[in-house]
């Protein structure tokens, strides 16, 4: 694949990841009622974030915002955070790596400044989807415990009034937003990894170049017995190299100046 | 304002399936479930189950579940009941109801009274 | 199914007195999600079909008279007229609003004296 195919590729999957991340952040539905017993409730609960919502069979939804910030789990507040992180490095990134791609020119941005910045948005994306990642399953073990926590309570010491009266407990398993958010996650960290994979195909070749400043002679050069090649580039392969005023390019280099099929 | 209009009696043989209507408006009528309730003389309330006008999704009273069946015609904003194989014991005022909060039924028809004889 | 048990199942006051009437349920109508307890009452007269009183086991609805009062939480429920008017004869019916079957009580008859 090519160094452009995989920048543009690793920006747009990071993008898509990046969009779902901020998506799971603000869905409702991180935890879910469990309907297992009862597949069909006529209150249907479910919590996310930052607001807990009530859906009647009646078709009326009522949701309350979590007013208060001390009366918060920790964990909650965690996972809070780590999402918010994961966004915030994600437009970081975004930005940065819109700058880095190579289709795009900016004054006389070289292609060593574009490796950096390749390279910065995709630590950038890695550490988001990474983010994103822990913060999600931070919350999902968060709901196992819960549940298994709920579920021995409904089998012990049922209900009061010597046991006439159940008391209806309320289970939560994963929500949409769990799902989106793994997913999300996962293809901004693949997006960061393409980007530092491109990355390594926008830096130019130093060694291959810089070690040697004379020009071998042409006598030298027939006395050598076999191997040592004038650039000394130690063994690497130069083969799709090609010299222009004494610095280095690769032949997708060669196609850096826009034309109109750059732009898509 | 809101109404939901049902014949005022019908009388139907025994065996004989009979289709009770409910005829909505003053309302969106596919944004509110229609539920119907059976109440025999000088007795209580019966939910027997609910359907949803938009994609006519139903739930039912297992008690009634191969008794009624719950159907909507939604150009003419129109709820039906059909109940199968109709014996005395099916001779009640079937209500039907809009659903509100709370699961709540906050408009009522008139009621049919359904006579089942021969 | 959750059983709903009305106590008394009827009761005669004169007009101008406080009454209160008891439902109970065999399982708890509080949903945790929202703090609301779905249990909702119905008032019927005779000959016609019951209306709405009180949903959420104590919100009013609309055009109901504030002498009405519904309270209570979990599976104890309160429905007070506090103070009877002739009008208010009618058979009382609370119902199960938390989880199908949809169940009612079987009644508290109200007369007046």
């Known amino acids: 694949m090519s160094v452009t195919a995989c920048q543009g590729l690793g920006f747009v999957v990071s993008l898509i990841g990046f969009a779902g991340i901020i998506a799971a952040t603000c869905m409702d539905q991180w935890s879910t009622q469990d309907l297992y017993n009862n597949p069909v409730t006529a209150v249907f609960n479910y919590q996310g974030l930052w607001r807990s919502c009530v859906r009647e069979s009646s078709g009326f939804t009522e949701c309350r915002g979590y007013f208060t910030l001390l009366g918060l789990p920790a964990m909650l507040q965690a996972v809070r955070a780590l999402m918010i992180v994961g966004i915030v490095l994600g437009v970081i990134g975004i930005l940065v790596s819109i700058f880095a791609l190579k289709c795009i020119r900016i004054g006389s941005m070289d292609d060593s400044a574009k490796a950096k910045m390749t390279l910065t948005s995709g630590i950038l994306f890695i550490i988001s989807g990474i983010s994103a990642i822990i913060g999600v399953s931070v919350f999902a073990n968060m709901l196992v415990t819960n549940f298994w926590m709920s579920t021995a309570n409904m089998y012990s010491g049922m209900g009061g009034m010597g046991g006439m009266v159940q008391t209806v407990q309320t289970r939560y398993t994963f929500g949409a937003a769990l799902f989106v958010g793994w997913v999300a996650g996962g293809l901004t960290l693949i997006g960061g990894v393409m980007m530092c994979i491109a990355c390594r195909g926008l830096t130019p070749d130093d060694s291959n170049f810089k070690a040697v400043s004379y020009h071998a002679s042409g006598q030298n050069v027939a006395y050598r017995p076999g191997g040592f090649k004038a650039s000394t580039g130690f063994g690497s392969n130069t083969r799709n190299k090609k010299i222009y005023d004494g610095g280095a390019r690769t032949e997708d280099d060669e196609q850096s100046h826009p034309t109109k099929y750059d732009y898509v | 304002q809101v109404q939901l209009q049902q014949p005022g009696a019908e009388l139907v043989r025994p065996g004989a399936s009979v289709k009770l209507s409910c005829k909505a408006s003053g309302y969106t009528f596919t944004s509110y479930w229609i539920n119907w309730v059976k109440q025999r003389p000088g007795q209580g309330l019966e939910w027997i189950g609910n359907?949803?006008?938009?994609?006519?999704?139903?739930n039912y009273n297992q008690k009634f579940k191969d008794k009624a069946t719950l159907t909507v015609d939604k150009s003419s904003s129109t709820a039906y009941m059909q109940l199968s194989s109709p014996t005395s014991e099916d001779s009640a005022v079937y209500y039907c109801t809009r659903s509100w909060r709370g699961n709540s039924f906050d408009y009522w028809g008139q009621g049919t009274t359904l006579t089942v004889s021969s | 199914d959750i059983v709903m048990t009305q106590s008394p199942s009827s009761l005669t006051v004169t007009a101008g007195e406080k009454v209160t009437m008891s439902c109970k349920s065999s399982q708890s109508l509080l949903n945790s999600g929202n703090q609301k307890n779905y249990l909702t009452w119905y008032q019927q007269k005779p000959g016609q079909p019951p209306k709405l009183l009180i949903y959420?086991?104590?919100t009013r609805e609309s055009g109901v008279p504030d002498r009405f009062t519904g309270s209570g939480s979990g599976t104890d429920f309160t429905l007070t007229i506090s103070s009877v008017q002739a009008e208010d004869l009618a058979v009382y019916y609370c119902?199960?609003?938390?989880?199908?079957?949809?169940?009612f009580g079987s009644g508290t008859k109200l007369e007046i004296k």
């Open positions: 959420w086991a104590s």
């Open positions: 359907i949803y006008p938009s994609d006519s999704y139903t």
């Open positions: 119902q199960n609003d938390y989880s199908y079957p949809f169940t």
